[in-house]
């Protein structure tokens, strides 16, 4: 058993049928010695008397808010949460496995640049009695500071019969140098509590590996005289790290017909313009990627050919 | 990317072209190592990230773009003890800092070159003959060093009398390649920045 926060405790249980559970001793936070009784949650049934209460915690029915009283007055509370260990592996019931980029990916994180700011998000089908708390650091043995905000509900989606809820959090490394070569990964830890169930999820990454630039901005077409060709031009996104000659991007320009089946023409360039053939009803899209470190491509910025 | 690429002319700055080749070569070598050594811990998540140039060179600090010198977090430890001649500087008037930067890059390359050559000698003794260093990568390191053209003491190749532990050598190869790729990215950024300025 360990303390999650004041008066909230997590009991770690080896989770299998008929498991013996864990013996827990609760102590009433009071100078009083006599006439103390204990109850669980809203029930008035007296579980025991005395300054300490010894319980065997086996299942969720044994968890909850234990309260010690004296003469009708509440003296203190202890909330017990359960953390299930199933065959040596901590349970992951609360969050959904996003399976991208690999199995058992519960937290996904992205950064728009090298400033040390990043966003993480996760999915759940649970709509109520749910709280999250996020901590982060650079490295784990001698951690350096990363400040995270509060997790907020950022999207709701309908997936088949189920509603899916997306939560996200923004974090900022306290003293980040965009040009630094990372040798210690960022660690992100999310505590999730659903009713009386506690779970924790972690992700470890280098900012360089989670970079996903915003799409190029000011995408424009300039028709070339007496030709089906157009000059496409664009600019670096505002959110990208500067100077751009140091933090350079490379671009992919795509000409896509109205039908998804039509052949896509693609050109790769390090410049912020390209000459392409504009077909009728086609659209031109441009996306960006770090020129020197191949992390994710940005989303496409698009304009119609007409 | 095996697709048409419109590449800018390296122009007056001969090192840019070499640094691009270097990044391509080390990335290819790392990919090959990951595939060949699939039963070894060779991914970014599994290895310890060690920098053999730590406390010996300070490329990131010495080569910091002017725009980032205002960032307190980037100014931890600026070294100022490098040699100041080099052919990449020939065509333009350069600052003392730029000379320090290029000389720091040269020292990095020299250290990695020695490590890789020592490692290759060990790998050639492996009866499994599982992996060797790409000669193209070693050649590209050499070409960039020649383009930088700094006079510097030659570092003798490390020789070891004891029987090599091939498992450890292959893991060390992965560690070195990951670190060298990160340094190659920095070098490419620096060359691109210097070329633009």
């Amino acid at each position: 058993i360990w303390e999650l926060k004041k008066d909230v405790y997590v009991v770690e249980l080896d989770w299998y049928p008929d498991a013996p559970g864990e013996m827990v001793v609760l102590t009433c936070d009071t100078p009083e010695e006599d006439g103390i009784t204990w109850t669980l949650d809203q029930s008035s049934e007296v579980l025991g008397s005395g300054k300490t209460l010894t319980i065997q915690v086996k299942e969720f029915g044994d968890a909850g808010q234990y309260t010690c009283h004296k003469g009708g007055e509440v003296l203190s509370h202890s909330l017990l949460l359960l953390h299930k260990k199933e065959d040596g592996i901590w349970s992951t019931d609360i969050l959904k496995d996003q399976k991208e980029p690999k199995n058992k990916t519960f937290l996904r994180c992205e950064a728009k640049n090298y400033s040390g700011r990043f966003t993480c998000w996760w999915l759940t089908t649970i709509s109520t009695d749910l709280t999250f708390s996020v901590k982060s650091s650079r490295g784990s043995s001698d951690p350096q500071g990363v400040t995270c905000g509060a997790a907020t509900l950022s999207a709701e989606r309908v997936r088949g019969d189920n509603k899916e809820y997306e939560y996200s959090v923004e974090c900022q490394e306290d003293s980040a140098c965009p040009a630094a070569e990372e040798s210690l990964p960022i660690e992100v830890m999310v505590d999730a509590v659903h009713k009386l169930k506690y779970e924790n999820y972690t992700s470890s990454f280098f900012i360089r590996d989670i970079i996903k630039p915003d799409p190029p901005k000011n995408l424009q077409l300039k028709p070339l005289k007496n030709s089906r060709q157009v000059e496409v031009s664009w600019e670096y996104p505002d959110t990208w790290s500067t100077p751009h000659s140091y933090f350079s991007l490379t671009f992919c320009v795509q000409v896509q017909g109205k039908s998804k089946r039509e052949k896509k023409d693609r050109v790769f360039t390090d410049k912020t313009s390209a000459t392409v053939i504009c077909r009728k009803n086609a659209s031109i899209s441009v996306r960006a990627q770090d020129r020197y470190y191949s992390s994710s491509w940005s989303e496409w910025a698009s304009v119609p050919c007409s | 990317r095996n697709l048409p690429v419109a590449t800018p002319d390296p122009g007056m700055f001969p090192c840019l072209h070499h640094s691009q080749n270097l990044l391509r070569a080390v990335s290819n070598m790392l990919q090959k190592a990951r595939q060949t050594l699939e039963f070894y811990p060779c991914t970014s998540e599994e290895i310890d990230h060690e920098d053999i140039t730590k406390d010996k060179t300070s490329t990131v600090e010495a080569c910091l773009p002017l725009e980032l010198t205002k960032n307190e977090s980037c100014l931890n430890s600026r070294e100022t003890s490098f040699i100041t001649n080099g052919s990449c500087l020939a065509s333009r008037k350069t600052s003392f800092m730029m000379a320090l930067c290029l000389s720091s890059i040269y020292e990095d390359l020299k250290m990695y070159q020695v490590e890789f050559k020592t490692m290759n000698a060990k790998l050639l003794m492996d009866p499994k003959r599982q992996i060797f260093l790409d000669q193209n990568m070693l050649a590209v390191i050499d070409e960039l060093m020649q383009a930088l053209n700094f006079n510097s003491e030659t570092v003798p190749q490390k020789s070891s009398l004891e029987e090599p532990d091939f498992y450890k050598t292959k893991i060390k190869l992965c560690i070195l390649l990951h670190a060298f790729r990160i340094r190659a990215v920095t070098i490419d950024r620096v060359m691109s920045y210097l070329n633009a300025s």
Partner: antibody, heavy 115, light 112 residues
Framework: QVQLVQSGGGVVQPGRSLRLSCAAS????????MHWVRQAPGKGLEWVAF????????YYADSVKGRFTISRDNSKNTLYLQMKSLRAEDTAVYYC????????WGQGTMVTVSS | SYVLTQPPSVSGTPGQRVTISCSGG????????VKWYQQLPGTAPKLLIY???QRPSGVPDRFSGSKSGTSASLAITGVQAEDEADYYC????????????FGTGTKVTVLG
Amino acid sequence: QVQLVQSGGGVVQPGRSLRLSCAASGFTFSSYGMHWVRQAPGKGLEWVAFIRYDGSNKYYADSVKGRFTISRDNSKNTLYLQMKSLRAEDTAVYYCKTHGSHDNWGQGTMVTVSS
Amino acid sequence: SYVLTQPPSVSGTPGQRVTISCSGGRSNIGSYTVKWYQQLPGTAPKLLIYGNDQRPSGVPDRFSGSKSGTSASLAITGVQAEDEADYYCQSYDRGTHPALLFGTGTKVTVLG
């Protein structure tokens, strides 16, 4: 004490269907994940499927994906395996078992797919 | 598609020490704990070892398990006639958890 009693096995022709049941008692069935494991005659153990405690997630071996469906009725304390498009290679003793560091197995039920 | 490899058979005389190996990789044994089962003819498997080296109550202490890196082993010190059975190791794999990953199985024969 924990008990898992299996039923539903038998002889069936290729292409036909069969539903296995596993009745649980002696524990809070709705709190635990459950597996199906099979063993072909004279062969080793092969995992077939898993279902979470609340039925929210199901996982299948590639060899049965799209043909077998694992389900549970927590109000009846029963686990099911619906087997469709049966093949000769599905012939085996099928076991249900609890998920956890200590596990409990059903007695096994024989499924024979033969024409 | 067994990824955990066991020797097909091992044998020993009563009182001898018998060991069974179970070889895997970084994504299975290297990442998860290992269990060992004993299966007597015509019966369901019985758990002998969980968590690499833990014995459930009721399992004789002549059975012991260990794990090192990407392989595990089961030792029977002072093998007895009633130990003649099939033995299976079991773990998980990073790519497929919670699918159970079983070893190929080992037939233990007690001679004499």
